[in-house]
């Protein structure tokens, strides 16, 4: 009994339950692969719970083992689109700091229009999360159909 | 030592660790194009630890964030059958309360017969999932090939 | 206060945190259509956290409910590659003690070079996970391209 | 810096072909589609098609369908559209077109070329 | 085919005034979180100049007194501020769906 209300008076936050799911806010400029991302409560069902957003790239507060996982839609586009344009890659990594660069997940479209893939990963406080988009196909900027997240699992 | 006794003789439930893995059960009369889902012990590997069904759709006992996570492979397919056939799209939502209407998880098929895919995403006591598989191929009702779960991450 | 200390003082294994995630190794000989895995920080970002590897297949080493993720790139594929080779498919099933063999995750390339999926199953002490791969199209070995990891859910 | 050079002026007779040709430099060629856009005399922009030369397929308005073909040379970095069968409405300047980053607004244009179909 | 209707046909501003060009898409334009409208200027003898792209984004290198906006099947580019050199035709163009069509054009003169 004692136990079970001194588990409710701890903030969530002391048992490490980081977790964020983002959304699409836009692409970058010309020579700029990456994708930016946005989130909270305001915008829809994306939500930030200890990681924080640098300039639309994922920051993480709490060392730890992460399910870091990801779904993006190509906007306008069929497998004939895409068996007509260069082929489209995403790429989820390690961005910053420069000495942790290193890509963790990879993905290529081929003649699909959608991606979606999920990884566990060790991540540290200060990395930041960067999804490098190459191609010519625009992303779609729907909630359902392009999203970005991190769950803290262990430490 | 006391502090490990107390959290074994705690229930589960206490700790919000919700989940739910079910499997295909049929598909909807011809209008209806939900999936209508069954889990239990006694069916295989599926089961529900919180979550109950309702008409063959999911519904949520526990307030916090959860994973969804879906796989759906159409049967008897290959990309030539798929490519012949009007786009098959899955749709994951919450379909009731009507007030809490959103769709959370799609994808196309395009010329693949499998999609498979994971988000978080708040849901709260009493909100029913709902899949819409639209399209004119049938799903595969193999445990290996189709099903849909949730587990809850965190309040 | 006394409950935080107590909680950072108990071993993680006795919260049941049982998590890996793993690199391909190899493919097995020409009769074996295994994938054999392997783990560990001097790897990379690859690591065992309670299940073990035994001859490349991962053990689990704690009952419970398990989320099972895998993804698998085939080498120097595109979707016109794909299409012109024996369709491949790759399995994910308990493979030993024989008694509790069954498959648990199934799906095919079609014309992608790529799958990824997840799903919740209960996995007991002693379970062994194997990966078959069948087709003629060899899986890529990189790190963010072809990964399979656990993590326990709940008991 | 991205260019698109287009090839010189032609003199058509109705029912005859032509050839227009739009050679790619400051950028990996087969990267971008190249679209084709045409503008008859005091009127407005036409879109006609594209092509991807990372593999040469084409997609073309169903108005030019059955007379338009085009084509690339990934050795010379070149593009062409071929228009034929042609009649005096077709008399136009021939633009080729490619977009920035992504694919549907033309960021880099040739200088055009100027096709008269008269007999 | 999205029919695309531009208004008005020519247009007459004063140095320093606001000028304002209208599209109208026979059905929307808008999908996947964009509104897939571009504007174009185009003055004699050359090739069109993108303006703006997806409604309201601001091409490099283009003043900041052109603006876009619009959603669904109505847009609008404005002008701010006219000077001299904005003297040229004016083209709104989808890119919804192939085929990509444009809208007939706007002249815009100064009074």
């Known amino acids: 009994q004692r136990f079970a209300q001194a588990q409710q008076q701890l903030p969530l936050e002391s048992l490490g339950w980081d977790v964020a799911e983002l959304q699409l806010n836009h692409t970058g400029p010309q020579q700029d692969p990456r994708l930016y991302w946005q989130g909270g409560p305001a915008l829809g069902r994306s939500f930030l719970h200890g990681p924080e957003l640098d300039k639309g790239q994922l920051r993480i507060h709490r060392d730890g083992i992460y399910m870091v996982h990801i779904q993006v839609t190509l906007a306008i586009c069929s497998s004939t689109t895409a068996s007509r344009h260069h082929p489209t890659t995403l790429a989820v990594g390690i961005c910053s700091p420069a000495s942790r660069s290193i890509s963790l997940l990879r993905l290529s479209f081929h003649q699909g229009c959608t991606i979606a893939s999920q990884r566990l990963t060790p991540l540290a406080r200060g990395d930041t999360l960067c999804t490098n988009l190459t191609g010519t196909l625009l992303p779609s900027r729907n909630t359902d159909e392009t999203f970005f997240g991190v769950q803290w699992v262990r430490p | 030592q006391r502090f490990a006794q107390a959290q074994q003789q705690l229930p589960l439930e206490s700790l919000g660790w919700d989940v739910a893995e079910l499997q295909l059960n049929h598909t909807g009369p011809q209008q209806d194009p939900r999936l209508y889902w069954q889990g239990g012990p006694a069916l295989g590997r599926s089961f529900l630890h919180g979550p109950e069904l309702d008409k063959g759709q999911l519904r949520i006992h526990r307030d916090g964030i959860y994973m969804v996570h879906i796989q759906v492979t159409l049967a008897i397919c290959s990309s030539t059958t798929a490519s012949r056939h009007h786009p098959t799209t899955l749709a994951v939502g919450i379909c009731s309360p009507a007030s809490r209407s959103i769709s959370l998880l799609r994808l196309s098929f395009h010329q693949g017969c499998t999609i498979a895919s994971q988000r978080l995403t708040p849901l709260a006591r009493g909100d029913t999932l709902c899949t819409n598989l639209t399209g004119t191929l049938l799903p595969s009702r193999n445990t290996d090939e189709t099903f849909f779960g949730v587990q809850w991450v965190r309040p | 206060q006394r409950f935080a200390q107590a909680q950072q003082q108990l071993p993680l294994e006795s919260l049941g945190w049982d998590v890996a995630e793993l690199q391909l190794n190899h493919t097995g000989p020409q009769q074996d259509p295994r994938l054999y895995w392997q783990g560990g920080p001097a790897l990379g970002r690859s690591f065992l956290h309670g299940p073990e590897l035994d001859k490349g297949q991962l053990r689990i080493h704690r009952d419970g409910i398990y989320m099972v993720h895998i993804q698998v790139t085939l080498a120097i594929c595109s979707s016109t590659t794909a299409s012109r080779h024996h369709p491949t498919t790759l399995a994910v099933g308990i493979c030993s003690p024989a008694s509790r063999s069954i498959s648990l995750l199934r799906l095919s390339f079609h014309q992608g070079c790529t799958i990824a999926s997840q799903r919740l199953t209960p996995l007991a002490r002693g379970d062994t996970l194997c990966t078959n791969l069948t087709g003629t199209l060899l899986p890529s070995r990189n790190t963010d391209e072809t990964f399979f990891g656990v993590q326990w859910v709940r008991p | 810096e991205v260019q698109l050079v287009q090839s010189g002026a032609e003199v058509k007779k109705p029912g005859a072909s032509v050839k227009v040709s739009c050679k790619a430099s400051g950028y990996t060629f087969t990267t971008y589609n190249i679209h084709w856009v045409r503008q008859a005399p005091g009127q407005g922009l036409e879109w006609m098609g594209d092509i991807y030369p990372g593999n040469g397929d084409a997609s073309y308005n169903q108005k030019f369908r059955d007379r338009v073909t085009m084509t690339r040379d990934t050795s010379t970095s070149t593009v062409y559209m071929e228009l034929s069968s042609l009649r005096s409405e077709d008399t136009a300047v021939y633009y080729c077109?490619?977009?920035?980053?992504?694919?549907?607004?033309?960021?880099?244009w040739g200088q055009g070329t100027l096709v008269t179909v008269s007999s | 085919d999205i029919v695309m209707t531009q208004s008005p046909d020519s247009l007459a501003v004063s140095l320093g005034e606001r000028a304002t060009i209208n599209c109208r898409a026979s059905?929307?334009?808008?999908?996947?979180?964009?509104?897939?409208m571009h504007w174009y200027q185009q003055k004699p003898g050359q090739p069109p100049k993108l303006l703006i792209y997806l409604a309201d984004n601001l091409e490099s290198g283009v003043p900041d007194r052109f603006s876009g906006s619009g959603s669904g099947t109505d847009f609008t580019l404005t002008i701010s501020s006219l000077q001299a050199e904005d003297v040229a035709v004016y083209y709104c163009?989808?890119?919804?769906?192939?085929?990509?069509?444009f809208g007939g054009g706007t002249k815009v003169e100064i009074k």
């Open positions: 163009q989808h890119s919804r769906e192939l085929p990509y069509t």
């Open positions: 059905r929307s334009v808008s999908t996947s979180g964009y509104s897939y």
């Open positions: 077109a490619r977009f920035s980053r992504f694919d549907g607004w033309f960021a880099y």
